[in-house]
């Protein structure tokens, strides 16, 4: 067996010789060198060599602890004549001895750290650390003490856990803000002999708010204009404050004084300054000079420093206000006038008024800016701010008028100032109801007594856009013995209801019904439309056919001659007729015009004029273009002068050539498929200044029935199948 | 259905004042024009005063010009008559009526007497 | 002023009786004429507008007509009830002017 205890070896060995470690040995070993002992493992035959005879081992080199605390090796005894081990291979530890050989090392070599300023003593700081390589199981080779070499009174640090403490009251960061403490770290539990190692702790004390701001002076003093709008920044003060970062922080307010409403104090946040800025418009004239209290404090306050004093300071500020020229001020920032449409000219509607605020009171003028009424539709009195109509007014046209009026110092013009006045114009029954559309209806020639033809609705362009009430009723010229009666429905609509059972359309083909709408405001307003009953012929459903008296539709007997010869002779007679009144210039019939009592009932009037050529009317062309309206006593409800068209078309303008202008109506009446195909007056209130010799017969117009093209017909769906058949095909060039 | 209700007569001084009121009910009274019509007792019917339907335009007859006062609240459905300087021959029922021209609807009529 | 005259003052008539009243006016007012009824300690009622237009409600006895300066109402078959005095009264221009009225009485 083997026979060897654990071996041990001193580190860092310095002496010339090999280091001996220990012998290997076996009981087998005779001592007559048969045996022959082997190393091997860790550092065999390296750093650890064997007499292979005797068993020595020796440490060729000086070992580190620290580096390589134990080594394990193999042994081995080998009968040296056989080669065979006489043991059985064992392993066995080398544990290297720990000298004192390394001194503590801090984890940093500077730590930095902070601490609030007047913080309580034994206030923790910061905590270092030191390590030493050593062994910490074998004596006090790794047993480190921490001591501080530099930063008394202010720090100290406990030995065993390197904590740092405050050790001093009341460290002020105002006086002082940076210390530089160096701490010691010794082994051999801090005895004689120990290594050590240092390291510095850079600390800093943070700001706490123990300082209150405070004014560098009691008084301040600035001037500023009155002209000064709200917002405007007259001066700056500043507190100053020895913390630091929020801890100097400032709010500014105005706690008191004669203008504290007048004025506003901000902070401007990047210098920590009080800006004074105006709040309320000033006026050099009530007041020149504000005195103010303007406070300064911290907004972030420690309770546990309260006991140092009120941490705000205050000062006084004297504002004084520089007089301006001023312009004059009305006495509102807007007017609002009403007016009735009726107003006649130069009616005064209200007044404004401004005067100059300063102190000299210059004398005021008023005048409408021109922009805001370019139709001069308004004055004013320069002198007393009257404002008057001159022109007429229609609501119904522009309900508001946004005027403007400038006020302007007479002694010095350049100060002026401007307001807004709008002006409403009040309603005033001046419109009368009307038809809502055009009427033009039908009567079957079978129709029975008190058949409903058409419902009339009316509109009326004055107020109440709530509604209206509307009456109606036939003309009273047309009431008697008329072939239809109006029925009022009481809901602003009536309904044209038949009056007897049966009309001829060969007796009459077209009625004109002349209905009088009425409201029932004030002063009452009204007018009279008229609606074109046409008799037809229908089918049994009441469904129209024929509107049109056969006998006059098919002009069968007649050639494109006759039909000439017709309208030549009549041309000349027309001709005759128009240059006989034109020098006549005076009729001895009923005059045109009706009397002023009955224009109120704007009757729009139609001459009968139906039958043929003895009884045409010669027209004075001055009457013709009298704009006044007319009516003929005569019966209302017959054949019209001119059978009306679906929609009214614009009159020609005054520079447009009358011959242009009528040869349009001749195209129109041309391809109207309602013109009627006996000779009837169109009449026009525009005749230009020439001649008005030209006929404008409704035979002369189509000079024979294939000018007309009725393919329309048949694009009127099934009502007009009959008429579409009895004109498709017919063809004119056969007509001979 | 319609109804007119007028309230505030009475007996007054000559000079003196008064305000009659018609409550209107049963029809859209902002689109109406209204009517105040009188009939002194055992007289005939005089037309007094009207206002449109926005308030916006008022008449009178002669011989109240000046010193009748017509308003209308809409908002209420109320007409008003204001009577300043009244004399003895004010004295009528005093009705007030529907419409601007022709009157559809009358109140039953409230009576000022005007005596000293 | 347009003065509105009526005729009769008043007249008797009995039950079935047809009855006329007219009005003139003092110039023309086209058809702008109402006629009204109004029985004692009542106020009156519109029975036509517009010179022949019946007001909705009224009986078909009552018609009216004219034109201009005269107009006419008529009763075509009088009735217990119709006994009343009657107005007319034009809206043709301001003032507006009633006439002094016709009062129907049993005969």
């Known amino acids: 067996s083997w026979m060897w205890n654990q071996f041990f070896l001193l580190e860092e060995y310095t002496g010339s010789d090999y280091q001996y470690v220990g012998k290997l040995h076996s009981d087998q070993d005779r001592g007559d060198g048969s045996l022959k002992y082997i190393l091997s493992g860790d550092g065999a035959g390296d750093l650890f060599i064997i007499n292979e005879n005797t068993g020595d081992i020796q440490a060729t080199k000086r070992l580190d602890r620290e580096e390589k605390p134990v080594y394990i090796l193999r042994a081995q005894a080998i009968n040296r004549r056989t080669g065979r081990p006489v043991e059985p291979e064992s392993e066995f530890i080398i544990k290297i001895h720990d000298i004192n050989d390394n001194e503590p090392i801090f984890t940093k070599d500077v730590y930095t750290a902070t601490v609030p300023e007047m913080a309580d003593v034994g206030t923790f700081v910061v905590q270092v650390t030191a390590t030493d390589a050593d062994d910490p199981t074998y004596g006090n080779s790794a047993k480190v003490v921490y001591s501080i070499l530099q930063g008394q009174p202010y720090f100290s640090v406990e030995s065993e856990t390197g904590i740092i403490k405050t050790a001093l009251l009341n460290m002020d960061r105002e006086n002082r803000e940076q210390y530089q403490v160096v701490i010691q770290a010794k082994d051999m539990g801090g005895q004689m002999g120990g290594l050590s190692g240092t390291t510095t702790v850079n600390i800093t004390l943070t700001d706490v708010n123990d300082n209150p701001p405070r004014f560098p002076q009691s008084t301040y003093q600035f001037k500023t204009p009155e002209s000064s709008p709200p917002g405007t920044p007259i001066g700056r003060i500043k507190a100053s404050d020895a913390d630091v970062g929020e801890n100097a922080e400032i709010e500014y307010s105005i706690t008191d004084g004669e203008g504290h409403d007048m004025f506003d104090v901000i902070t401007d946040q990047e210098t920590q300054e009080g800006i004074i800025t105006v709040k309320k418009l000033l006026d050099f004239e009530k007041k020149r000079v504000y005195t103010l209290k303007v406070e300064a404090s911290n907004p972030h306050i420690e309770p546990r420093f309260l006991y140092l004093g009120p941490f705000k300071d205050s000062a006084t500020v004297r504002i004084v206000v520089d007089d301006v020229d001023e312009p004059p001020v009305f006495s509102k920032p807007a007017y609002i006038l009403q007016i009735r449409e009726d107003a006649q000219i130069n009616t005064t509607i209200g007044s404004v008024a401004a005067q100059d605020p300063d102190a000299a009171r210059n004398p005021v003028k008023y005048s409408v800016d021109r922009h805001t009424d370019m139709d001069r539709i308004f004055n004013i009195d320069s002198g007393n701010g009257s404002i008057f109509t001159s022109k007429l007014l229609d609501r119904e046209t522009l309900l508001w008028h946004n005027i403007t009026v400038i006020a302007t110092e007479i002694n010095n013009p350049k100060q002026s100032s401007r307001v807004p006045l709008y002006i409403k114009v009040l309603d005033v029954n001046d419109n009368a109801p009307e038809f809502a559309e055009f009427y033009e209806t039908f009567v079957c020639e079978k129709a029975k007594a008190d058949q409903l033809i058409q419902t009339l609705h009316a509109v009326d362009k004055d107020d109440p856009y709530s509604g209206h009430q509307f009456s109606f009723s036939l003309a009273p010229e047309a009431a008697s013995g008329s072939n239809f009666t109006i029925q009022d429905n009481k809901d602003n609509t009536a309904g044209i209801l038949t009056r007897k059972n049966g009309y001829n359309r060969h007796e009459m083909s077209t009625y004109l019904l002349p209905v009088v709408i009425s409201d029932n405001d004030y002063p009452v307003q009204s007018s009279t439309g008229t609606v074109t009953v046409r008799v037809c012929a229908c089918d049994h459903h009441g469904n129209m056919q024929s509107c049109h008296a056969e006998a006059l539709i098919h002009p069968t007997g007649l050639s494109t001659g006759a039909l000439v010869a017709i309208l030549l002779c009549i041309v000349i007679l027309l001709v005759t007729v128009v240059l006989f009144a034109a020098l006549r210039r005076q009729r001895k019939k009923e005059p045109l015009i009706i009397s002023k009592e009955d224009i109120r009932d704007n009757i729009v009037s139609y001459n009968d004029e139906g039958g043929g050529e003895e009884d045409t009317q010669a027209f004075d062309i001055g009457t013709l273009r009298n704009p006044k309206p007319w009516r003929q006593q005569s019966r209302r409800d017959m054949v019209p002068e001119a059978l009306f068209l679906p929609r009214r078309t614009p009159t020609a303008r005054d520079n447009t050539d009358v011959r242009d202008f009528i040869s349009q109506r001749l195209r129109k009446m041309n391809t109207d498929p309602t013109a009627p195909p006996y000779d009837s007056l169109a009449t026009y209130a525009y005749e230009g200044t020439g001649s008005v010799a030209d006929s404008l017969s409704s035979l002369e117009s189509v000079t024979t029935d294939g000018d007309q093209d009725y393919g329309y017909l048949s694009d009127w769906g099934p009502r007009f199948k009959k008429l579409a058949d009895m004109y498709g095909g017919m063809d004119s060039d056969k007509d001979s | 259905q319609v109804q007119l209700l007028e309230s505030g007569g009475g007996l007054v001084q000559p000079g003196g004042s008064l305000r009659l009121s018609c409550a209107a009910s049963g029809f859209t009274f902002s689109s109406y024009a209204m009517s105040w019509v009188r009939q002194a007792p055992g007289k005939g019917l005089e037309w007094v005063s009207v206002i449109r339907s926005s308030g916006s335009s008022t008449y009178y007859a002669d011989s109240v010009k000046g010193r009748f006062t017509i308003s209308r609240d809409n908002s209420k459905n109320t007409l008003y008559l204001q009577m300043n300087s009244l004399r003895a021959e004010d004295t009528a029922v005093y009705y007030c009526?529907?419409?601007?021209?022709?009157?559809?609807?009358w109140g039953q009529g409230t009576l000022v007497t005007v005596s000293s | 002023d347009i003065q509105m005259t009526q005729s009769p003052s008043s007249l008797s008539a009995s039950v079935g009786d047809r009855v006329t009243i007219t009005c003139r006016a003092s110039q023309s007012i086209s058809l702008w004429l109402n006629w009204y009824q109004q029985k004692p300690g009542k106020a009156p009622k519109l029975l036509i507008y517009?010179?022949?237009t019946l007001q909705s409600g009224v009986p078909s006895r009552f018609s009216g007509s004219g034109s201009g300066t005269d107009f006419t109402l008529t009763i075509s078959s009088l009735q217990p009830e119709d006994f009343a005095t009657y107005y007319c009264q034009q809206y043709y221009t301001s003032p507006y002017t009633f006439g002094q009225g016709t009062k129907v009485e049993i005969k």
């Open positions: 517009a010179a022949s």
């Open positions: 009526a529907r419409g601007g021209g022709y009157f559809d609807y």
